[in-house]
Interface confidence: medium
Amino acid sequence: HGTELPSPPSVWFEAEFFHHILHWTPIPNQSESTCYEVALLRYGIESWNSISNCSQTLSYDLTAVTLDLYHSNGYRARVRAVDGSRHSNWTVTNTRFSVDEVTLTVGSVNLEIHNGFILGKIQLPRPKMAPANDTYESIFSHFREYEIAIRKVPGNFTFTHKKVKHENFSLLTSGEVGEFCVQVKPSVASRSNKGMWSKEECISLTRQYFTVTN
């Protein structure tokens, strides 16, 4: 009775910096006892490694077993349904999971006001799982860029975008007062990685922040 169960329809990675999650879609009409077996293959070592025999969720955190992702040729994963003694055929990820598949994020954005300028500092992600030498800036050591979106509340404009090539930026507010909300989306000019907009950070600018100069 080896392959009576249907296979998971699709299997894919969703990854951020040192947060590598494998996802799959459930088989149709799964029972309460259906679970999923996960295996991993590292390119260059052509054998599948069993990671989980029976996961009842539809995702699995593979970060701990893919810590060398940023120094390797990448991985493939496969998942099959298991129900008692029955199991399905494997469904394999249809693309190689490599550093190119990692969605870029920032850790946070810090804002302060000085002399009518909004000064922003982009904090890079510092995931707990990352080995000490594998910082964002060491892995993506060149061509880091950030798109900045600023919204003024209340105001007559929604966004202003700027590509900056470093982790600090400044915006001359030209006497505008109100609440300014900032989002940042990272990219690396030499790479094709997608970037994710950060959580919005806001700061209020009132007349007290403007200095009079003669």
């Epitope: 003024k152 007559n156 404009f157 202003t160 975008h161 915006l171 001359l172 507010t173 030209s174 505008e176």
Partner: nanobody, 127 residues
Framework: ELQLLESGGGLVQPGGSLRLSCAAS????????VGWFRQAPGKGREFVSA????????YFGDFVEGRFTISRDNSKNTLYLQMNSLRAEDTAVYYC????????????????????WGQGTLVTVSS
């Protein structure tokens, strides 16, 4: 002196698209932040969008809601405004304008920051 000449306006149905162009002559176009304002019948001039000299920063009025894109081609001394999903309330005369200064600043949201203006092109959105 910088001369600006808009084109591309016309009659379009709601939900349709138009691409406005603004051709510049005279002074060096590439050193200016340039933008679009509009004036609906019986209303004041309203900021639409602007783009810095090198194209790395764009500004949009809040009514744009992602429907418009602004771009420029410095080799052709031309500014563009691609307008999609047009609505009746987008009916207006659209003006091209150029400002001096290159700092990343909210001054470009203000009419008073723009020293050079075109004559305008009429966009009518109606079924």
């Amino acid at each position: 002196e910088l001369q600006l000449l808009e084109s591309g306006g016309g009659l379009v149905q709601p939900g349709g698209s138009l691409r406005l162009s603004c051709a510049a002559s005279g002074r060096t176009f590439s050193s200016h932040t340039v933008g679009w304002f509009r004036q609906a019948p019986g209303k004041g001039r309203e900021f639409v969008s602007a783009i810095t000299w090198n194209g790395d920063t764009t500004y949009f009025g809040d009514f744009v809601e992602g429907r418009f894109t602004i771009s420029r081609d410095n080799s052709k001394n031309t500014l563009y405004l691609q307008m999609n999903s047009l609505r009746a309330e987008d009916t207006a005369v659209y003006y091209c304008a150029a400002a001096t200064g290159q700092v990343w600043s909210l001054q470009y949201l203000r009419e008073s920051s723009y020293a050079y203006w075109g004559q305008g092109t009429l966009v009518t959105v109606s079924s």
